[in-house]
Amino acid sequence: NIDVCKLGTVTVQPAPVIPLGSAANISCSLNPKQGCSHYPSSNELILLKFVNDVLVENLHGKKVHDHTGHSSTFQVTNLSLGMTLFVCKLNCSNSQKKPPVPVCGVEISVGVAPEPPQNISCVQEGENGTVACSWNSGKVTYLKTNYTLQLSGPNNLTCQKQCFSDNRQNCNRLDLGINLSPDLAESRFIVRVTAINDLGNSSSLPHTFTFLDIVIPLPPWDIRINFLNASGSRGTLQWEDEGQVVLNQLRYQPLNSTSWNMVNATNAKGKYDLRDLRPFTEYEFQISSKLHLSGGSWSNWSESLRTRTPEEEPVGILDIWYMKQDIDYDRQQISLFWKSLNPSEARGKILHYQVTLQEVTKKTTLQNTTRHTSWTRVIPRTGAWTASVSAANSKGASAPTHINIVDLCGTGLLAPHQVSAKSENMDNILVTWQPPKKADSAVREYIVEWRALQPGSITKFPPHWLRIPPDNMSALISENIKPYICYEIRVHALSESQGGCSSIRGDSKHKAPVSGPHITAITEKKERLFISWTHIPFPEQRGCILHYRIYWKERDSTAQPELCEIQYRRSQNSHPISSLQPRVTYVLWMTAVTAAGESPQGNEREFCPQGKAN
C-alpha cells in the first residue's frame, strides 16, 4: 500500500502508458524538508519493481541521474505487456536497522495500439428486435480500449454506442437498442467501429447493409396440424409467422428416420397441405421463415411439432402358414399361423384378426376373431378345406388372404431334391434344394419352414417360415436363428392342391458336444446286445449331432477300442451290436459327433455276454 505520497513524487517520461519495447524514465523526488533527519547526503532513493504484487527487482543499478539526497531518475526497459507497479523508497543509510520508507509509486502500462476492427456483422432478430453488431477486435491491446459503434442511415440519422475492453471484460458486441422496420427495406445503412486507447486509434472499413441483409425472422410458432376427414396421409400444417415473411421451408420426418422431407412454400400465409404422409406414424415437423425470396437469412428452425398421423385401413396381404395333425381316423387338428403386418401395411393398431375355415364342397364355414397370430381348430379329415385371414384396425380390415389346406408332405413326387443346409455365419443358414423330379402339377411356391430341435418345440413354439417363388432354389434363413442350436428345416413344394416336402437338420454355428450320451441299459436278445441310451440334454448338444459312436473293449485291455457309428435319429435311442465274445467282460461307452468334432465319452458300463458268439 502506497501512502498518499507525503514524502515526495514519482513521475514517468514519456508517459505512464508506453508501447511494447519502449523504455521509460522514472523520476523519484523528495518534497522539501523531507528525507533523513541528519543530512541530505544520507538520503538514498531506491526503486522497486512489482508484478502482480510480487517484488521482482530492485532497480538500484538502473540510475541514470542522481541529485544526491533530493531526486533520482531510473531507466526501465524490457517491460512486459500489462501493468507493472514501481515503488520509490527512501533508505536512510546511517540507520541500518530501519527498513526503507515508501515515498510514492507509479503504475506503468505496456500495450499496443488497437488494430482496425474487422468482420463486422449486424443482426436483428425478428421484425420487432433490435440491431446488434459484433466484430473482431484483433490482437489484445493490454490497455483499456474504447470502442464506438456508429450506424448511419436514412433520415440523416447517425446512431452510436460505446463500450470498452480491459483486463476484466471484452468488448466485441453491442446492441444499439434500435429497431429497423420493414418500411426501411430499400434503405442502406453504413456501420463502422472505431477503437481508441492511449497509444492510438483505428477504424474499421465501413460495412454496408440493408434491412433484408440483417433481419432474421423469428422462428414460426404455434405449429399445429389438421388431418382432413381424419385422413392418415393428408394433413394441413398451420403456424404463426411474422407479418413480412414471404418464404417458408418445411421439413418433416418419421421419428425413427434419419433424413428429412423438405418443402419450400411461397406466400404460404401460415398454411401448407401435405399429401404424402404415412398413416399411424409418429412425425416431427419444423418450419423456418425468410423475409425475401432471393435475399436475407432463414430463421432458426421452429420448435418441433411431434404428432402421430391417424390410422387408415390395413393394406397388404398376411403371410399365412399352417400345420396339420391327425387326431384319429376321422378328425384332424389344423393350426393356422400368420406374420404380423409391418407398420406401413398395418397403418394402425391391429385390434384383431378375422379367421375363416371353409369346407369347399359342403360349404361348412368356421369363423372367429382372435388377437393372436395363430388359431387352432379340430375339423373333419374329409373334404377340401381352405383358410383365410384378414387384419383389422379401427378404420377397417385388410383384404383376406386365402390358403388351401393340403397334405403338406403327402405327395412324394412333389418332394424337393438334394436339400442342403450350410451355416453362413453366426445367425443364418443357407438352405438350397433342387426342384421335384416328376411333379405331375406345377409348383406354385416353396415354403422353407424351421424350428429348433428341442423338447416340446412343436407344441410350445410356432414355426418360422419363408415363402419362396417357384423359380428360386435357395433361402437364407435368419429369423430366430441362434448359434449352437440344431434346427429341423423342411422345404415344402406346394401346387394348387398338393404338397411334398423334404427335411434336413442344420445349424448356424457348432461346437463339439459337451458330453456323450448316457447308456441306460445293455440287454442281450438272441445273441445280440442292445445298447440303450438317453440323448444328450439339448443345451449340451451345441449344434446338430451327425452320429453317435458306441465304443467297446475288453476290460483291462490296453488295445484300441472297437467302435460302431450310428446315423443320428432323434427317435432312436437303442442299437444292436453283435461282435462281442460270450463270457468276456467288456467296457462300453458312447460319444456324439457334430460337424465341429466329437464329444467327451459318456458314462462307462460293463457287460459280460452270456450267449454264443457269432
Epitope: N128, T130, G153, P154, N155, N156, L157, C159, Q160, K161, Q162, D175, L176, G177, I178, N179, L180, S181, D183, L184
Partner: nanobody
Amino acid sequence: QVQLQESGGGLVQAGGSLRLSCAASGFTFDDYTIGWFRQAPGKEREFVAALSWSAGSTFFTDSVKDRFSISRDNAKNTVLLQMNSLKPEDTAVYYCAAKNPPHRWSDITKSLQYAYWGQGTQVTVSS
C-alpha cells in the same frame, strides 16, 4: 404530473459552446428515448439529437454529429446536450421531448412520435 424542463440556453458567439439540460419531473426516463428538437423562426421543428435511456445509444442528425454530444445524469434524472463549435444557423428554440418504446429508426426523428414536451429554451448564435 409529467413535466420536462429545459435550461442552459442563451446568447453565444459563433464557435462558442453551450450546455443545455433537460430535467424530468413526475416520471423517470427509465425506458424512454429523450430527444432534442429545435425550431428556427419561420421553419419547421427539426430533430437534433436523442438518447435511448435504457440502451445507452445516442442519435444525431448529420449536421451536428461531430459538434454536439448527448449524455445523461442518472442521479438527477436529466439529459444534457453539449453544443460545441456553434454556428449562426444553430440559432433556434431548443425543445426537450420524451418518447415511449418501441424505439424504431423511422420514429426517432419524427416529432409526432414524442408524447411529452418541454417549453423550450432559446439559443442564439451571433456572428
